[in-house]
Interface confidence: medium
């Protein structure tokens, strides 16, 4: 009823002292190699001369940090990044960073990278609204503090401020065009 040699599992390493013979009921815990993380139970148990349990180690590393336009990576570059490792970016002049300067490898995926935007605080086209339009011809770029007005299509009523303003590269909240209640 004893068990002999320990079973081997990909990227899993048995902990403790290796023995020639394991008694029935004895448990052995495995740990994962660098870059790998245990998925589920980490032990095997000796039952009736056989080992039960199957520790599974999955790769949680990341490769190729996200590319950020107008930025470069200032931390050391690696071919493979373990989960929890961070990578730091810096924007090229005259761009300004929106988002945190670091991304983190989180169980095989990178967190959202920052953006490097034109620091002048310009805005893109105003946001579209349902059943309404802006009253002026839309431009691709708007200067800081510039504003536009919305109007609703026939039979729709405007709720909120009809004028929105560009501030810090972001438009203020646009109005809504609501269908009037029919009584």
């Amino acid at each position: 009823t004893d068990c002999l040699s320990l079973p081997s599992f990909e990227n899993a390493i048995p902990m403790g002292e290796k023995k020639d013979v394991y008694k029935a009921g004895e448990q052995v815990t495995y740990t994962c190699a660098t870059y790998y993380k245990m998925d589920g139970a980490s032990n095997v148990t000796c039952i009736n001369s056989r080992w039960t349990g199957r520790p599974t180690c999955r790769d949680t590393s990341c490769v190729n940090p996200p590319t950020v336009q107008n930025a470069y990576i200032v931390s050391r570059q690696m071919s493979k990044y373990p989960s929890g490792e961070r990578v730091r970016y810096q924007c090229r002049s005259p761009y300004e960073m929106f988002g945190d300067e670091e991304v983190m490898c989180l169980n095989g995926n990178w967190t959202e990278p920052p953006q490097c935007k034109d620091s002048t605080g310009k805005c893109g086209p105003p946001p579209p609204i349902d059943n309404g339009d802006i009253t002026s011809f839309p431009l691709s770029v708007y200067a800081p503090a510039s504003s536009v007005e919305y109007q609703c299509q026939n039979l729709y009523q405007l709720e909120g401020n009809k004028r929105i303003t560009c501030r810090n590269g972001q438009w203020s909240e646009p109005p809504k065009c609501l269908h009037p209640c029919v009584i």
């Epitope: 924007c91 300004e96 960073m97 929106f98 988002g99 945190d100 300067e101 670091e102 991304v103 983190m104 989180l106 169980n107 995926n109 967190t111 959202e112 920052p114 810090n168």
Partner: antibody, heavy 117, light 106 residues
């Protein structure tokens, strides 16, 4: 350990402004952004805005016209100011550290704000 | 902005039971995060980016989902899990939160 401690008034008159200071410890504001979130019985949790490690800000468009977030890296302090308060702005205001993907991993203890005359 | 609908609003479970709560988004989202909040306390980070448990969260918790439908599952509920759980999306600005699922223990 990482902490965010908030200080600010509990009672604000309508049309007045609200100022809250968030003092952080065990991490640097030059590395991490700080978000502001509020919680009220009527509207639940609402994201108000964030100041990033580089000092740039993003605001919820619904609050943008009356909200300003600034910071002093050397003092490890983030400052929140909201103007023209309404009774509707009553709630608990939290500062919280950015983790990534606009999630937060550590929250301040909250500042309970009542807007009333 | 994206609206997140959490169901059920109140979930009653016995210790040892398996429970699942869901969060549905009005449009597809890139990331879903979960927070736990106990009465009188600040929220606590619980699950990041759909399925990554925050530091100190017991492995009986798991998260899954994609697109517009996400869920948080507790394999065997314990008394200390009684709290309100909120989902939060990121992908479309502004980030928004669900109204919460309150987990009560029988």
């Amino acid at each position: 350990q990482v902490q965010l401690k908030q200080s600010g008034p509990g009672l604000v008159q309508p049309s007045q402004s609200l100022s809250i200071t968030c003092t952080v410890s065990d991490f640097s504001l030059t590395n991490s952004g700080v978000h502001w979130v509020r919680q009220s019985p009527g509207k639940g949790l609402e994201w108000l805005g964030v100041i990033w490690s580089g000092g740039t800000t993003e605001y919820n468009a619904a609050f943008m016209s009356r909200l300003t977030i600034t910071k002093d890296n050397s003092k490890s302090q983030v400052f929140f100011k909201m103007n023209s308060l309404l009774v509707d702005d009553t709630g608990i205001y939290y500062c919280a550290r950015n983790f990534g993907n606009y999630a937060v991993d550590y929250w301040g203890q909250g500042t309970s704000v009542t807007v009333s005359s | 902005q994206i609206v997140l609908s959490q169901s059920p609003a109140i979930l009653s479970a016995s210790p040892g039971e398996k429970v699942t709560m869901t969060c549905r988004a009005s449009s597809s989202v890139r990331y879903m995060h979960w927070y736990q909040q106990k009465a009188g306390s600040s929220p606590t980070a619980w699950i990041f980016a759909t399925s990554n448990l925050a530091s100190g969260v017991p492995p009986r918790f798991s998260g899954s989902g994609s697109g517009t439908s996400y869920s948080l599952t507790i394999s065997r509920v314990e008394a200390e899990d009684a709290a309100t759980y909120y989902c939060q999306q990121w992908g479309t600005k502004p980030p928004t939160f669900g109204a919460g699922t309150k987990l009560e223990l029988k």
